[in-house]
């Protein structure tokens, strides 16, 4: 059990106050993390509170300002990037968000040697992506879907691609579906380690169907947003990977990297690119039916001036029980010999673990094992491998950092974080300097987050980078809810749950229950992290019990649980939420006449299906931006878990798993349906179809749309949304305002 101390003593009770909705909406109790911007083994940059860019040297203990806030302010810069030769800094301003990761911006180059902005051959605007080469100060950037190269910031640009066209051809940046569902980045270009070569992807969206929706704005006529967006079963983007020599790019031209034959034989995806050396690159490909992934290692043949990807350097990863990988196929971390690598994939027992691949995947050496999962490989040095896992004390919702000594035999394992601040810190990530000389640990909870700096050799803590003292002080007179993480064992399935309990929780009393659900494949909601959010307020002030349950389909507990939902989305996720609710009722402190469920996105889909399950368990519920039919969602995501919506594949379950098919079952629940009209991700179409089906079935429901808002419902919409949902729940639970 993880009990967050509420620090309530009888003598202090009258000085303590509950959380208010205003606290949440104002972000009063938000925390800070500190991620060093590493620039060498022992140096990092950090933007100070007063916006100076400061360089810190860990070994000398010295720090100095490399860029003043005055310079930053002169171009309204909100971000920066130092060139590896430390001669120039790019300053980013006029940030304009596009999709989840992508944005455009204006870039200025500042010359640190003369303290002036580079004049002549200035960068065009707005730029879609810009980055320095890993060595020196070459620049690659994407403008109007084409890639440009500058040998020096003041030089004229060399145009590498010419076919870029809005919504048609994307060079060096992903299209919508690759950005959201495959690469999870705003870029699709990669410098080789010393900057000799530049690899890039070209996405051809010419034949992709377009989603169109109105953006109302302030004009007399709304404008139409058009996005090439492949829904399940639709035509997909065509991807090609090119590599160009950046030293003399005008000569040989871009060279296309061959796709492995077994991949190219049908529709496929490119999933990631990893440079190994300047002359070796590793590409990962995935069949459209995403249970086969191929990792291909390609070498530059100097004599032929060509990239060679021999079949002997193709490594196949296949899943027979589900899809390849977890959410994404894992990426390799190469060792110092530049051919062998470490990679996370399922072992014979169905748990994701680190394997060492020297020649073939069949001969892989398993590095970690157990009924838990390795989650991320942070760094491989000559003698150590740093990774995170949820092994410690068998809590899947924890993350600790481990070091395996690969220089010695047999390799020894050490948990770096398990006992550092055991009560406060059970969920870590890490950031390593060059050669892992130093690293920062960022602890996300369950206590107040803290960031610390450590020696990479001894693991000794050097200093605290951020401990959120102000937050700690601010929370001293707040009655925080209690939190506990436990598990239910039901029919050979382990259901981990997090319960958030009112500060003066009394097991002998009855409380309204709110289930918060996400439940998407390879997600995890039950995590040992700190948060003061809307559900904290509902427990603290409104006296609700909130529960989060990780059912079948969720991550980091083995393939049996993860792949249980394969080709059957919308069945077991819902069943497991219902099962958990029944178990919570049995605990004796839940008022079974006041149970609600809510979720956003995939969670909106699950909450809708749970409400329409016909169990009579739920009095009311909320779906925010829900998927309503898998035929309406993105191909890359949907088909990974559902296959294709064709008669000879899985059309039947596509049809059976819609919210609309269960419209009649909403008759006996109070349903609040919410969606942004400019949702580029889960299109408003999803909620429009739910609403239509409910109207056609003559079922009453409540709805709220947010004009011109996307999937995140940000800004003032957030305040309106949570206020509206609070009123709805309080009304449902008969709580006075």
């Amino acid at each position: 059990i993880v009990l967050r101390p509420s620090r309530v003593h009888n003598s202090e009770e009258n000085t303590m106050r509950a959380l208010t909705l205003k606290d949440i909406l104002n972000g009063t109790f938000s925390y800070k993390t500190f991620f060093p911007n590493w620039i060498s083994g022992q140096e990092y940059l950090h933007q100070s509170a007063d916006n100076n860019i400061v360089l810190y040297n860990i070994e000398t203990g010295q720090s100095y300002t490399i860029l003043s806030n005055r310079t930053m302010k002169s171009v309204n810069a909100s971000n920066y990037g130092l060139s590896p030769d430390r001669q120039f800094v790019y300053l980013e301003s006029d940030y304009s968000k596009l999709w989840r990761y992508s944005y455009t911006a204006t870039y200025y180059i500042y010359d640190l040697s003369n303290g002036e902005f580079v004049r002549g051959n200035e960068l065009p605007r707005p730029i879609q992506y810009l980055c320095w080469s890993p060595v020196g100060s070459k620049l690659a950037y994407v403008y109007q879907n084409n890639i440009y190269l500058k040998q020096r910031p003041g030089d004229p640009p060399f145009q590498i691609t010419f076919n870029g066209r809005e919504n048609k051809i994307f060079n060096g940046i992903p299209d919508w579906v690759y950005e959201e569902e495959m690469l999870a980045t705003k870029y699709a270009l990669w410098w080789s380690p010393n900057g000799k070569f530049l690899a890039y992807a070209e996405f051809n969206d010419t034949d992709i169907p377009v989603i169109a929706y109105s953006y109302y704005g302030d004009e007399q006529y709304p404008r139409t947003i058009n996005i090439p967006y492949p829904k399940a079963g639709a035509k997909n983007p065509v991807v090609r990977i090119f590599i160009i020599d950046t030293t003399y790019p005008a000569y040989v031209g871009p060279q296309e990297v061959p796709v492995p034959a077994m991949i190219a034989s049908s529709d496929y995806y490119f999933s990631w690119l990893t440079w190994v050396t300047d002359e070796r690159v590793c590409l990962q490909w995935l069949k459209r039916v995403q249970n086969v992934s191929v990792l291909s290692i390609c070498d530059f043949r100097e004599d032929w001036q060509t990239w060679d990807c021999p079949k002997t350097q193709e490594h196949i990863e296949e899943s027979r029980t589900g899809w390849a990988g977890g959410f994404f196929v894992s990426t390799p971390v190469f060792s110092y010999d530049a051919i062998s690598y470490y990679k996370i994939f399922s072992d014979k027992d169905g748990y994701k673990h680190i394997h060492y691949i020297k020649d073939t995947v069949e001969n892989a050496i398993q590095i970690t094992s157990g009924k838990w999962e390795a989650i991320n490989i942070f760094r491989v040095t000559q003698d150590s491998l740093f990774y995170s896992s949820n092994e410690f004390e068998e809590y899947p919702g924890r993350r600790n950092i481990y070091r395996i000594s690969i220089g010695s035999y047999p390799p020894s394992k050490k948990c770096v974080t398990c006992h550092l601040r055991k009560e406060r810190c059970q969920y870590y990530t890490a950031s390593f300097s060059d050669y892992a000389k130093y690293y920062a640990l960022v602890c996300y909870g369950p206590g107040i987050p803290i960031s610390t700096l450590h020696d990479g050799r001894t693991d000794q803590e050097i200093k605290i980078l951020e401990e959120n003292k102000e937050l700690e002080n601010a929370l001293k007179n707040i009655q925080l809810p209690k939190e506990e993480i436990k598990k239910l064992e039901v029919d050979e399935i382990t259901l981990w749950y997090k319960m958030i309990l009112p500060p003066q929780f009394d097991r002998s009393k009855k409380y309204p229950l709110l289930i918060q659900v996400y439940g998407g494949p390879c997600s995890q909601s039950v995590r040992s992290v700190f948060a003061v959010n809307w559900i904290s307020y509902l427990a603290s002030k409104e006296g609700m019990v909130i529960a989060l349950v990780d059912g079948r389909g969720t991550a980091f507990q083995g393939d049996k649980l993860l792949y249980a939902v394969y080709r059957k989305l919308g069945v077991y996720e819902v069943e497991d939420q219902i099962t958990a609710v029944r178990k919570f009722i049995e605990m004796g402190f839940i008022d079974e006449k006041r149970i609600a469920i809510w979720g956003w996105s995939y969670g909106g889909y699950v909450s809708s299906l749970a409400l329409a399950s016909g169990t009579g368990l739920f009095k009311c519920g909320i779906a925010v931006a829900p998927v309503s039919s898998w035929e309406y969602y993105a191909s890359v995501y949907t088909e990974r878990f559902m296959g294709l919506p064709t008669k000879d594949d899985n059309l039947e379950h596509y049809k059976n798993s819609t919210v609309m098919a269960r419209a009649e079952y909403f008759r006996n629940v109070d349903y609040l349906l919410i969606h942004g009209t400019a949702d580029d991700n889960v299109h408003f179409q999803n909620s429009a179809q739910i609403a239509k089906a409910l109207v056609n079935a003559q079922v009453d429901f409540q709805a709220m749309w947010y004009s011109d808002q996307n999937h995140g419902l940000s800004g003032l919409s957030t305040n309106h949304l949570y206020t509206h949902m609070t009123h709805f729940l309080k009304q449902c639970f008969s709580l006075s305002d």
């Epitope: 040998q151 030089d155 030293t247 005008a250 000569y251 040989v252 871009p254 032929w304 060509t306």
Partner: antibody, heavy 117, light 108 residues
Framework: EVQLLESGGGLVQPGGSLRLSCAAS????????MSWVRQSPGKGLEWVSA????????YYADSVKGRFTISRDNSKNTLYLQMNSLRAEDTAVYYC??????????WGQGTLVTVSS | EIVLTQSPGTLSLSPGERATLSCRAS???????LAWYQQKPGQAPRLLIN???RRATGIPDRFSGSGSGTDFTLTISRLEPEDFAVYYC?????????FGQGTKVEIK
């Protein structure tokens, strides 16, 4: 030894078509971008078109865009230039050259195209 | 497009003399994208100085390229009889690649 050998030139009437070929040997043809460069009688050099090694991307001078098509057959180590709607001003010696936009380090001997009625 | 202007149009020199040929670009090019070619009557052009001011394979060291930005120079330190020809500069930084109009180096 790198060799480029053009063929297919000749006399053609305005509005007519010709297809030039360039047979390559002595290097990994499929790895390199290739170009066509022309030279009008007694005049300077003019870049006409280029194609990258895989053949997937092509580039043209404005003067020939929409009329000329560059292509390649990597299995035959051959570069092509399909010329349609020929004009008098297209009269030139056409060279195939190894390279994309610059540093053309190998050239064929050229083939003469004469557009005249 | 980038216009390359070569000067002089004709250079009359004797064998053994130094030849300095100029190429001026209408906008910045940088040496990474400028090449020089030699062409003799009835022959195809031959690459002398590759992009990046590097001598092409088999080119004698009496040929050298220099310059940056918009002004570039091809220098032939001691003219040999076989060097009398037309010389072209060419930029490859911007589409379309363009050539200068040529400088003819003739025997005085």
């Amino acid at each position: 030894e790198v060799q480029l050998l053009e063929s297919g030139g000749g006399l053609v009437q305005p509005g007519g078509s010709l297809r030039l070929s360039c047979a390559a040997s002595g290097f990994t043809f499929s790895s390199f971008a290739m170009s066509w460069v022309r030279q009008s009688p007694g005049k300077g050099l003019e870049w006409v078109s280029a194609i990258i090694g895989s053949g997937s991307n092509t580039y043209y001078a404005d003067s020939v865009k929409g009329r000329f098509t560059i292509s390649r057959d990597n299995s035959k180590n051959t570069l092509y230039l399909q010329m349609n709607s020929l004009r008098a001003e297209d009269t030139a010696v056409y060279y195939c050259a190894k390279g994309w936009f610059g540093g053309f380090n190998y050239w064929g001997q050229g083939t003469l195209v004469t557009v005249s009625s | 497009e980038i216009v390359l202007t070569q000067s002089p149009g004709t250079l009359s020199l004797s064998p053994g003399e130094r030849a300095t040929l100029s190429c001026r670009a209408s906008q910045s090019v940088t040496s990474s994208y400028l090449a020089w070619y030699q062409q003799k009557p009835g022959q195809a052009p031959r690459l002398l100085i590759n992009v990046g001011s590097r001598r092409a394979t088999g080119i004698p060291d009496r040929f050298s390229g220099s310059g940056s930005g918009t002004d570039f120079t091809l220098t032939i330190s001691r003219l040999e009889p076989e060097d009398f020809a037309v010389y072209y500069c060419q930029q490859g930084i911007m589409l379309p690649p363009t050539f200068g109009q040529g400088t003819k180096v003739e025997i005085k």
